[in-house]
Structures are given as C-alpha cells and as structure tokens.
Interface confidence: low
C-alpha cells in the first residue's frame, strides 16, 4: 500500500539503484516515485553532513523485501516511494529554494525582476529543467537579477551549492503550466533524426509517448512497430532530443511512428502509467512472482498491488491453467519496460497501474505545493482541492468554498446551506482558478446528497460542517485533486505554515473576487481566541487563525473553504472557514471548524453512504 511517513535522522543502508542531487527530501521522494526500481530513498540535507560532495545527496533504493535496515544519521531524511499513492503521484514541484544554487548546463541567461518571472521563463522554455536567480542583493553587482536557465543529463542538478542571495527552482512544465503548448499528432511512417537519449521496448507508440513525456530529456520519439523490417529493432522506442528542441529532419519510413513529448501541454498531461492490456502479447522480464488468478484484469490488479511489479503476462496456455484460473507472471526490469515483446502468443500483457493518478479512493494528498482580505492571487494547480459552490436560481453566483476530499466528496460549512438546502440549485466547480472562466459550457458537478452535521443549528457557530456527495465521481488531475484529512483528534502537531484560500470579499463591504486568493495566516491558541470573543464560546472543536494587527483574513464568500497547513511536506485540511467578527479586524481572528475533531463523523458518513470508506487520514 501507500506509505507516506518520513523518517527523520535515519538513512537506509544498502539497496542503491541511483543517486543524484536534489534540493530537499520531497523532490528526492518524487524522483524515487518515478524511478522504475526505487521503493525507498534517503536524503542528506546540507546541514547533515560535512562532506561537500554528499551534501544534498538523494539516494534511490530498492529492496527485494520492500524494506532496508535504517541506520541513525543526524539530519538525514528517509522515506518511501509514492508508487501506489494515487493522486499524490505528481512530477510537479513548485518550491523555490532560497540561498541555494542548483548547478547544471547554463544555456540561457537574461535579466528579470523576480524569481517567479525566472521560473516562468524556465517553464516556457522547451529545454529548461531548472533555474537559478541572483537577487537584487547578490554580492556581484553585474550578476544581480540574472535568470539562468539550466538542464542536465538526468534532469536533476549536477551539484547544489549553498550560496547567499541566490534562489533556485524547477520548471513547472510537469505541473501542466507551460505556455509552449504541445503537439498531440502521431506521425505514421515517419522517423525523426537527432540524438537518442534512451531506448526502451514498448508495445505501441502511445506507451512510447508517455515514457517520453516523463523522461527528463526526451522531446520527441520514434517507435518501430512489430512489423519493422529489422527484427532486433521491432517495438523499439527511441527517446530523442535536439539542440533546437525540435527534430532537425524526418525521413519517410514504413512501419515507424513518431511524435512529441506531451510535457509542454497546458492544463492536462497524460497519466504516468499505461492502463491498456495487450491480447496475444507476452512481455519478457525478470520473474518476480507467478500466481494463479481468474482473468487478465485480476492479473493486472495483482501486479499493481505488488509494488515491485512493473508489468505482467497472463498466460492462457492449457498447461498454465487450472479450472478457471491461469498463471499470472509478474515481472520487472531495470528500466520498467519489457526486455522482450513477443506477438501471436496465448497470453495477454500489460503494465502495473502503480503510477496511475486516479489510484485508490482511500488515499490522501501530499502534493501541490469568505474572499481573502490581504491576500494575493493564487496560481493554477496551487490549491487543487478548492471548489466553488455556486447557486443557480435566476442568475448564478458563487456562495461558498469547499474542499475536495475524495472522488465523490466535498467538505464544506453547514451554514452555506442555511435557507438553501435544495440539492438541484447547487453547481460545484472544481479545477478552476478564475470565476470569470466559467461559462454555460464549463462542466460542473451536481449534488447527490447534502449531509449537514446533526448537531448544527442555524445561526449558531457550533458543528459548522457539511459533506456533499457528488452525483458522479471526479477524475483527479494536477488542477483537481483531494486534500488530505488530519488524523482523528490531531492535537500534537504544531502547524506553522497555514493558508486560507477563497474567492470571497477583499474587504468587509466588498465583492466576490475573480481570481482565487490565498493568504498565509498563523494559528491562534483557543485560549487567546476566547479572550477576543468573550460573547461566544470557542470550543475544542474550533480552531482560530489570524494576525493580532488584523489585515489578513477570510471573509464573506470564503465560508466552507479550506484552512490548510503544510507539515512534513504534506498539506492537511486543518479547518473549514466558518465565522468571525467582521473581516481582518484587529485582534479578531477568524474561526474555523476543526476537522480533526470530526474525523469519526466524516468517516461514518462517507462509509455508510455506500458501504466503503472514500478517504483516509495519513498513515
């Protein structure tokens, strides 16, 4: 299953499959997730080791048993690959690293006014993988405001150095935020020239294209079909690059197929997995296990559940079958692709779905990286769980926010439904940033069921929580995925990085905002909060957040939306925007429903609704 815990001051011994430099443990974990053999990783932050060569070292590891011995190493961070973790699987990494220079091949330098602009330039350059930006206070005046676009053979820095007044980060192309756009066309009977960066065997050009999309240096590809004239080259997928970023030439060639990486697509990337099953095809590889199962789909499920399994062949040979069950060969290879593909067999083959984003309903997210008063504009995919609850009567308007917590579930505030408990007037928009982008053609979800907490009373602040069951489940994308719920009764975690988001008013007597706003707000103790609200009872089932001086807060229209906090690289839904005295007033913090206190209720309602738990707290 999915293991998300990180081990502080621990280093996995042995099992190395690869190593690289990464700026933090989360990026190291992402590289482990996408490495075909990596199950575990260990990361050495700069503070953990004196050896300059090993600072920022990210060690990817495999183990036949699924585990490795842990040794104590001060400062080291270790953890698991997020294979099998569904919507937590993402190659998108938004963080900016201050005081760090990520080294690579510098192929472009320009003057820009901010690190965000530098990141945008990198994202809009086809070859840029990461960048460094020298700030206004950099010690050498001639380098100030320089934006260096970089790449490397493996897509990760060739070295990482601690350097004051330098900020570094990665391209946001894997976040589907590139302005370049992509070529979806597949070119039959055409071979591209230029540099081969890798060679794998694939059953078709579509698998070849997906592998190209997630390979750090592949910009385009050529696939040789199973009837290509040279037998040894059949089913070969050549991943390619060029200096210009496009093929310098192409040759008409029977039984070849060419195309482009889809990494530069805007708003949607292919899933990093291959779900198709190939009848009459055998995939060769290292044998992991052989099991008797009923049907090829069960064989694929078995492969998906066995974390080291990369692909499988389900044999229908009489000698491989007993009654209704046949042999399911679970296999793996060095690069995650079959070592041999044979046609015209009595088998069916396919791949593990361990890297599919849709994944299991019961896993929470760690990724992404009332309008808000004193906030700033959010960017695409920054808060992919945020939804807009809108009412369509004569006109249509945004009333509340909400948080996606499962394929078919949204968590919001009960008071959003005061006077509007009718299911059919509500429209739920997910995966959006600008309310102005909503037209009559924009897809929305309808409500199947509104579940208001049984102890909620209109115009009281207690138990302000409601669940919405959607009529149809949503697919997860970079812009639409759930937020992780906290552990039941989570009181021990000290959250220091909390954000409130919404399209609500920007001042007390304001109006709904177009762009989703975000604001960083510190949590306030319940004792402190109670002092500020002497006419109200601040219960243990509430959480407060705000600045003593005011100026930043949630406001009308943000209600029901998320208060999320990042802890150990994982975002958790700590609160639901509920109420407050005005907006952003001095010494009047916002009051939020404390989600951890309602975990039993959430799990009971989502389970009883269709007999199966739909979301789960982090492990």
């Amino acid at each position: 299953g999915c293991l998300t815990q990180l081990y502080e001051n621990a280093f996995f011994r042995g099992g190395d499959v690869a190593s690289m430099y990464t700026p933090n443990a989360q990026y190291c974990q992402m590289r482990c997730t996408f490495h075909p053999r990596c199950l575990l990783f260990s990361f050495l932050p700069a503070s953990s080791i004196n050896d300059m060569e090993k600072r920022f070292g990210c060690f990817l590891k495999d183990s036949v048993t699924g585990t490795l011995p842990k040794v104590h190493r001060t400062g080291a961070v270790s953890g698991h690959s997020l294979k099998q973790c569904g919507h937590q699987i993402s190659a998108c990494h938004r963080d900016i690293y201050k005081g760090v220079d990520m080294r690579g091949v510098n192929f472009n330098v320009s003057k820009v006014s901010s690190v965000e602009e530098c990141q945008k330039r990198c994202t809009s350059n086809i070859r840029c993988q990461f960048f460094s930006y020298a700030t206004q206070t950099f010690h050498k005046a001639e380098y100030r405001n320089n934006c260096l676009l970089k790449y490397s053979p493996g897509g990760t820095p060739t070295a990482i150095k601690v350097l004051s007044n330098v900020e570094s980060g990665f391209s946001l192309k894997p976040c589907a935020l590139s302005e370049i756009g992509c070529h979806m066309n597949i070119f039959q009977h055409l071979a591209f020239s230029d540099v081969d960066v890798a060679r794998v065997l694939t059953p078709d050009a579509f698998v070849c294209r997906t592998i190209c999309t997630y390979h750090p240096n592949c910009l385009f590809f050529t696939f040789y079909t199973n009837v290509w004239k040279i037998e040894s080259q059949r089913n070969v997928c050549l991943l390619k690059t060029s200096e210009s970023g496009t093929p310098s030439s192409s040759t008409p060639q029977e039984n070849t197929i060419s195309g482009y990486s889809l990494l530069t697509c805007k708003r949607t990337l292919p899933e990093p997995c291959h779900s198709k099953i190939y009848p009459g095809v055998d995939f060769g590889g290292e044998e992991l296990n052989v099991t008797f199962v009923k049907g090829v789909n069960v064989c694929q499920e078995t492969c998906t559940k066995m974390i080291r399994c990369q692909f499988f062949t389900y044999s229908l040979l009489p000698e491989d079958c007993k009654e209704e069950k046949c042999k399911c060969f679970l296999r793996l290879s060095m690069d995650g692709s079959p070592t041999r593909i044979a046609y015209g067999t009595q088998g069916s083959s396919g791949y593990s779905l361990r890297l599919c984003n849709t994944g299991d309903n019961s896993v929470c997210t760690t990724k992404t990286s009332t309008r808000i008063v004193g906030g700033t504009n959010s960017s695409w995919g920054e808060w992919p769980w945020q939804v807009s609850l809108q009412v369509k009567l004569t006109a249509q308007r945004h009333l509340c926010g909400g948080s996606l917590i499962g394929h078919q579930w949204v968590l919001t505030a009960a008071h959003c439904f005061d006077g509007l408990p009718l299911q059919d007037v509500w429209r739920i928009y997910s995966g959006i940033l600008n309310l102005s982008d909503i037209t009559k053609d924009t897809p929305f979800s309808q409500i199947k069921e509104i579940i208001i907490h049984q102890n909620y009373k209109v115009s009281e602040g207690n138990h302000d929580i409601a669940l919405i069951k959607l009529q149809a489940p949503l697919n997860y994308t970079e812009f639409q995925k759930p937020i992780c719920l906290p552990s039941k009764g989570d009181t021990s975690t000290i959250y220091t990085n909390c954000w409130v988001t919404g399209w609500g008013f920007s001042k007390e007597k304001g109006e709904i905002q177009n762009i989703l706003q975000k604001v960083n707000i510190p949590l306030v103790t319940n004792e402190e909060c109670q002092k500020r609200y002497q006419d109200y009872k601040i219960t243990q089932r509430m959480v407060c957040a705000g600045y003593k001086e005011g100026g930043k807060d949630a406001c009308k229209g943000d209600s029901g939306g998320p208060l999320v906090c990042k802890h150990n690289g994982m975002w958790r839904l700590v609160g639901i925007t509920s109420w407050g005295e005005g907006c952003a007033r001095r010494e009047q913090p916002g009051v939020y429903t404390k989600v951890a206190e309602y975990m039993d209720w959430i799990l009971e309602k989502t389970q009883s609704s269709d007999g199966k738990a739909q979301m789960q707290s982090p492990a």
Epitope: G15, A18, S19
Partner: antibody, heavy 119, light 107 residues
Framework: EVQLLESGGGLVQPGGSLRLSCAAS????????MGWVRQAPGKGLEWVSG????????MYADSVKGRFTISRDNSKNTLYLQMNSLRAEDTAVYYC????????????WGQGTLVTVSS | DIQMTQSPSTLSASVGDRVTITCRAS??????LNWYQQKPGKAPKLLIY???SLQSGVPSRFSGSGSGTDFTLTISSLQPEDFATYSC?????????FGQGTKVEIK
Amino acid sequence: EVQLLESGGGLVQPGGSLRLSCAASGFTFSLYIMGWVRQAPGKGLEWVSGIYPSGGFTMYADSVKGRFTISRDNSKNTLYLQMNSLRAEDTAVYYCARESSGVAAPDYWGQGTLVTVSS
Amino acid sequence: DIQMTQSPSTLSASVGDRVTITCRASQNISSYLNWYQQKPGKAPKLLIYAASSLQSGVPSRFSGSGSGTDFTLTISSLQPEDFATYSCQQSYSTPRTFGQGTKVEIK
C-alpha cells in the same frame, strides 16, 4: 548483449601510476552503479571501488582509499580507475563490473586486465 | 568491515552429488548476499542474488537460502561444468566484502 572491456593494465614499478579503463556497451550505462573488483594471483576476490550512476558519489575499500580514484564518463560509456602510489600488494587481475539494480550484486563482469607492480 | 567466512575451503565431489557450501557473515546482513561461480582464467559469474533469487539463465539445480548471518548455496545434482570456485559476497554495506572462496573439485 552486455559487454565490459577493460584496458590499461601492465607492469609498473612500486610508487608508480596506472589508469584502467572499462568500455561498456549493450546497456544504458548512465543508469547503473559500476565498480572494480580485483583478484590477486591464487587469491579470492576483493571489492575495490564503486561509483553511482551520476558519478557524484564514490566508494572505496580501505586498502586503496586515498590512492585510487574511480570516475566515469557517461557520454563515452566508460569507467575509469586511476591508481597512484602503487604497491606490490596491488598486483592482481582487475575486473570491471556492473551492479544489478536493487541488490548491489555485480551481474556482469569484464574479462579482467592484469596489473603487475614490481621493481 | 563485515567479514565473510566460507566453508569448506575445498570440497571433493562426484558428478550427481548434492553439494552444499556455507557462508557466514560477521554481522546481520538480512538477505543481502550473492553467490558467484568462477572458473580458472575467467571472470566470476553471478548465480544467486539476494540470498535466494536465481539469476536469469542460471540452471535451477543451483539454489540459495539463509538470512541474517548464515547462508547456504546448494547444487542439487553436480554436473561436470560445475567444478569451479564459488564465492559469496555481502552487499549490505560498503565495502562489499567477499568470502575467501570454496573450490569444488572432482573426487
């Protein structure tokens, strides 16, 4: 077909230097940990050094630490072992080996190159 | 460093015999143990990795077992081509140490 071909061995005087090379083919060199293992005449195998795929991380046996340097050029699919301050006890056949992923077992070996340290 | 001790150093056997070689580690190495076969003038060949996993292309008469500190290589029915030296190697930690080898010779 995976192939590893060592070169650079020969006779050298104590205190001298040699550079061994290992040309790799038939696999994606840049994805694998590579290493050197030696075998003194009539003796068992002794692991000498290893290097990670990126080349950024290296490992050495205590007996060669500070004297030998392992390196690789992924663009040339070549592994190197720079041997300085050679001693008589470094006399051996030096094998280049590829480590299989996940279990750190050298799964493919070259045929070896003989290094003789003698005055 | 982890010491690897093999026994016996030499083993005389006939074709068709069942042969067992043991390898002991000076500390717990989980299942991080590999077995190699080497013939005179040739490079070693990987037989078994991770204590019991058979390397691709190796005959099934070879098998490995054990975990922790004690490991065994078994040849179920010795064939003429199996007369060689067998070595164990731990891959649990650096340096990756080998056993001193067991020579299987014709009785």
